[in-house]
Amino acid sequence: AVNGTSQFTCFYNSRANISCVWSQDGALQDTSCQVHAWPDRRRWNQTCELLPVSQASWACNLILGAPDSQKLTTVDIVTLRVLCREGVRWRVMAIQDFKPFENLRLMAPISLQVVHVETHRCNISWEISQASHYFERHLEFEARTLSPGHTWEEAPLLTLKQKQEWICLETLTPDTQYEFQVRVKPLQGEFTTWSPWSQPLAFRTKPAALGKD
């Protein structure tokens, strides 16, 4: 038997992936655990093996189909269970009725590229990945720029309150190396959270022309 508090948190990427983290205070030496997904209206069900990510937490990804296939809708509820092997039996350790479109976390934006760079400004674009057509334009973005001598945590957040997959960074310093990241969040869903940050895009502003201020 396992004692201690348990936390079971899952997010849907809006297409064909449910990522789950299960935390358990009590020790679970060498126990095999998995997450089982059972939708209330669909024919498929899916299982993934929980793998340790720290001393007391495990994670896994339920792959529901091809990355861009729409496997769930706003009407679906998925029963998610954490099952751990106890001898020859499986014991239910945690269970939740999961509403996918109330618990969204999209994939990080991809394909970041510099569209145009000058001495004091830089225009950057990106794409969203594996995002459902249900959102239409109901997405928002946050962006941050890493300046020399600073950390990501110190970088001010720029908020784009609409589906705008580009930004024009202003008031940059000439001939300076910067890094840029962006993340995305649907407006829908009570427990929806920000995507992970994108891979950083490194760019350098152009040097100031000689003889100019």
């Epitope: 209206r41 669909r42 024919r43 706003t74 009407v75 057509h133």
Partner: antibody
Framework: QVQLVQSGAEVKKPGASVKVSCKAS????????ITWVRQAPGQGLEWMGD????????NYNEKFQGRVTLTVDTSISTAYMELSRLRSDDTVVYYC?????????WGQGTLVTVSS | DIQMTQSPSSLSASVGDRVTITCQAS??????LNWYQQKPGKTLKLLIY???GLHTGVPSRFSGSGSGTDFTFTISSLQPEDIATYYC?????????FGQGTKLEIK
């Protein structure tokens, strides 16, 4: 095998109510949504609503909101559809069906005739 | 509500013919599209679910394809027992909606 057996034909007066039953067998009743669809003679199909027997959760087509009530009795694996304030255009066949990636099993249908 | 437009409303074909019915949704429904068969005086039978999944016990001459708003239902070689009305239905969002039906007759 999965079976949905509906109650027999009914004749009702305008303004009255009708309650159609749908008895399920051959599967775990509480694990699948039961949906209700109606069909006028020689006409198309109209979704009325659905109910999840495991929780009693319901969804209704707004067209019928306030007139239709879906319930279940899990002890006898039976779903019910009650339609109130009947009108002559409610003279149609009512079907129950199990939902599992489409409506995979259907009842035989219940004809309700509304006539004064 | 999502409107489902089926065409043709009726068609006549010979035994052995390839028969195609189309269904168009008024908005993107991804692959949440099902096809049903109804013979005269009978209840409905599910043939195809999630655009192309063949329901248990359904002959392989029935197939479906499409995505988004445009869908196709095909009978590769028409048999006498296929005489029926065929309906498409979306289960992408409530209220679920059906096409108006295609009545298939033998020439």
């Amino acid at each position: 095998q999965v079976q949905l057996v509906q109650s027999g034909a009914e004749v009702k007066k305008p303004g009255a109510s009708v309650k159609v039953s749908c008895k399920a067998s051959g599967y775990t009743f509480t694990s699948h949504w039961i949906t209700w669809v109606r069909q006028a003679p020689g006409q198309g199909l109209e979704w009325m609503g659905d109910i999840y027997p495991g929780s009693g959760n319901t969804n209704y087509n707004e067209k019928f909101q306030g007139r239709v009530t879906l319930t279940v009795d899990t002890s006898i694996s039976t779903a019910y559809m009650e339609l109130s304030r009947l009108r002559s255009d409610d003279t149609v066949v009512y079907y129950c069906a199990r939902e599992r990636g489409g409506f995979d099993y259907w009842g035989q249908g219940t004809l309700v005739t509304v006539s004064s | 509500d999502i409107q489902m437009t089926q065409s043709p409303s009726s068609l006549s074909a010979s035994v052995g013919d390839r028969v195609t019915i189309t269904c168009q949704a008024s908005q993107d429904i991804s692959n949440f599209l099902n096809w049903y068969q109804q013979k005269p005086g009978k209840t409905l039978k599910l043939l195809i679910y999630y655009t192309s999944g063949l329901h248990t016990g359904v002959p392989s001459r029935f197939s479906g394809s499409g995505s988004g708003t445009d869908f196709t239902f095909t009978i590769s070689s028409l048999q006498p027992e296929d005489i029926a009305t065929y309906y498409c239905q979306q289960d992408n969002n409530h209220p679920y909606t059906f096409g108006q039906g295609t009545k298939l007759e033998i020439k």
